[in-house]
Interface confidence: medium
């Protein structure tokens, strides 16, 4: 028979062969054969591997330090990471929770929407147009693009979410 | 190196006042936001005020507002905390931080004992 260019699902295709991808929770150690299986194995301790894979090494859990005001919410399993969270009173810097601070900062092009509180972290919001905000702070909101036309200016450049407009004297016309 | 170093603190009455510093160093000052928060012995941190870079915006926690004020001298790269009325339950160790990361940079802080 012709040999298969593509596999089911849960198959890879290898030496013009299917063989059955490890299950979530075991790594590769050899592919199947005309006469034998793929051979898989579990994953050691502190490892993991979440999907039907062909990987030969598992991965590590992440590592919640303390150091860095980390602890375990969740502990892994063979087939999960570890998930961390932060010390009460501290948020997560981002989803992957790789750092914590006391609160937020918004960054250029975000303002404040609602400031922090012992127990809610900062609230952040994109400058709507017309508005901007240059820097990162935890407390600022986006601030009004400048009127050039109540200075008796015109607008030389645009503003964006992240800088003000840049405002500059009329052109007079000549006689 | 990022060093920031706080001064002033000591013992003082209820109802006094304390003028906290923290001189800065290693970093640009006037382009970041300054925090104060402190640490009440047995409790957590919890944040008291923070500046702009530019001085012109000031943030207080409600426990301190118009008792305590903060201020900037970019010139000098120094911090204030003027506190006013001080309470027993003032009595912290506080500390100047350039930005509110856990491992971020903090000063070693300095002791602020309210009591009669």
């Known amino acids: 028979p012709e040999p298969p260019t593509a596999c089911r699902e849960k198959q890879y295709l290898i030496n013009s062969q299917c063989c059955s991808l490890c299950q979530p929770g075991q790594k590769l150690v050899s592919d199947c054969t005309e006469f034998t299986e793929t051979e898989c194995l579990p994953c050691g301790e502190s490892e993991f591997l979440d999907t039907w894979n062909r990987e030969t090494h598992c991965h590590q859990h992440k590592y919640c330090d303390p150091n860095l005001g980390l602890r375990v919410q969740q502990k892994g399993t063979s087939e999960t990471d570890t998930i961390c969270t932060c010390e009460e009173g501290w948020h997560c810097t981002s989803e992957a929770c790789e750092s914590c601070v006391l609160h937020r900062s918004c960054s250029p092009g975000f303002g404040v929407k609602q400031i922090a509180t012992g127990v809610s972290d900062t609230i952040c919001e994109p400058c709507p147009v017309g508005f901007f905000s240059n820097v990162s702070s935890a407390f600022e909101k986006c601030h009004p693009w400048t009127s050039c036309e109540t200075k008796d200016l015109v607008v030389q450049q645009a503003g964006t979410n992240k800088t003000d407009v840049v405002c500059g004297p009329q052109d007079r016309l000549r006689a | 190196e990022v060093q920031l170093l706080e001064s002033g603190g000591g013992l003082v009455q209820p109802g006094g006042s304390l003028r906290l510093s923290c001189a800065a160093s290693?970093?640009?000052?006037?382009?970041?936001?300054m925090q104060w928060v402190r640490r009440a012995p047995g409790k957590g941190l919890e944040w008291v005020s923070a500046?702009?870079?530019?001085?012109?915006?000031?943030y207080y926690a409600d426990s301190v507002k118009g008792r305590f004020t903060i201020s900037r001298d970019n010139s000098k790269n120094t911090l204030y905390l003027q506190m006013n009325s001080l309470r027993a339950e003032d009595t912290a160790v506080y500390y100047c931080?350039?930005?509110?990361?856990?491992?971020?940079?903090w000063g070693r802080g300095t002791l602020v004992t309210v009591s009669s």
């Open positions: 290693g970093f640009t000052f006037e382009w970041y936001e």
């Open positions: 931080a350039k930005e509110l990361l856990y491992f971020d940079y």
């Open positions: 500046i702009s870079g530019d001085g012109y915006r000031t």
